[in-house]
Amino acid sequence: ELCDDDPPEIPHATFKAMAYKEGTMLNCECKRGFRRIKSGSLYMLCTGNSSHSSWDNQCQCTSSATRNTTKQVTPQPEEQKERKTTEMQSPMQPVDQASLPGHCREPPPWENEATERIYHFVVGQMVYYQCVQGYRALHRGPAESVCKMTHGKTRWTQPQLICTGEMETSQFPGEEKPQASPEGRPESETSCLVTTTDFQIQTEMAATMETSIFTTEYQ
């Protein structure tokens, strides 16, 4: 089931999927001055069985100026497309979902593809958010959104992220130096909170980075 909407927009943040669920479609978009070849695929589709998932179809772009070009470019697996995202502000990185069954990795680029990729996500897809350059996350840890089906309608859960501009990092006289953030994953504790928002404490479960003890309760 395709998700009706795009993932939520968070001010000063971008999102990225670590892997794509089977059924995800990626539009075959070409950059300006190029178009899809005749009889070329409209989209790539993540398909597979219980043991292996991969992208069906190949996106191919050709120059709009030359109608009868014979050049048809196929994706080059050794290349990795550079996404328009910055490094995570948090010291933690989400788990590599691509190793999960039923998920495809980021498709390799094709020649003359558009600068932005347009995905059509399916229920169960998870995306991770990060603050854009010049902004920092108020809380530590992964901020994610999942497309869920509720009462016959799809919706994305609200990511737990606030990105603040770095305008007042200087300290007042006599103020102690800030502590360095501990590396790695924060330990989870046995009790849980009973509230959740983007104004949020997100106590994480040791077993997974995909949910927290109490975000699961509401989302």
């Epitope: 000063h12 108020l138 007042e168 502590q179 404490i201 106590t203």
Partner: antibody, heavy 114, light 111 residues
Framework: EVQLLESGGGLVQPGGSLRLSCAAS????????MHWVRQAPGKGLEWVSV????????YYADSVKGRFTISRDNSKNTLYLQMNSLRAEDTAVYYC???????WGQGTLVTVSS | QSVLTQPPSASGTPGQRVTISCTGS?????????VHWYQQLPGTAPKLLIY???ERPSGVPDRFSGSKSGTSASLAISGLRSEDEADYYC???????????FGGGTKLTVL
Amino acid sequence: EVQLLESGGGLVQPGGSLRLSCAASGFTFSSYGMHWVRQAPGKGLEWVSVISYDGSYKYYADSVKGRFTISRDNSKNTLYLQMNSLRAEDTAVYYCAAGVPDYWGQGTLVTVSS
Amino acid sequence: QSVLTQPPSASGTPGQRVTISCTGSSSNIGAGYDVHWYQQLPGTAPKLLIYSNNERPSGVPDRFSGSKSGTSASLAISGLRSEDEADYYCAAWDGSLNGPVFGGGTKLTVL
């Protein structure tokens, strides 16, 4: 169970200082931004200050900027608010809040009066 | 003066539906930040009632609902009960202040 316990409030003269503390338990304190929010008697909620999870940056409401200092000690799971040059209008219940802010302590009363 | 604007008071009789509005600006609600609602009973700390515009924490009855559009949001309480008598505050992050901003609060009276 998540707990935020404020302390350090009391009666102080104008121009004086106080240091509030907030002891946190029941969650991974070092992973979350923390706030101080205050409420003057019979008035609404007013945000005072925020500190990021690692203490690397801080923001203040204009009304307290230059007088109040927020800090945290992640090894002690404690949040602080150093209040200097106190004024009568700083009289309020001061809440420590976790996140931004979704979980609150019960508050500590600060009274600035001569 | 509060950054978010709420009516100072609202009232209704048991069983009625009451709506409380919250108006912000392009630096908070209008910037895409979520709106949250708190209930504060006399002498107690605020309690989260609605988060992320329209989500309810567990334990909050479905009589409480929220919505957001543009630079405004609203809290609706249906099937009003006497225990709903309290102060209600809206809040949202403000990108200009780099902190949360609150409404002035609405005192709800159940007649």
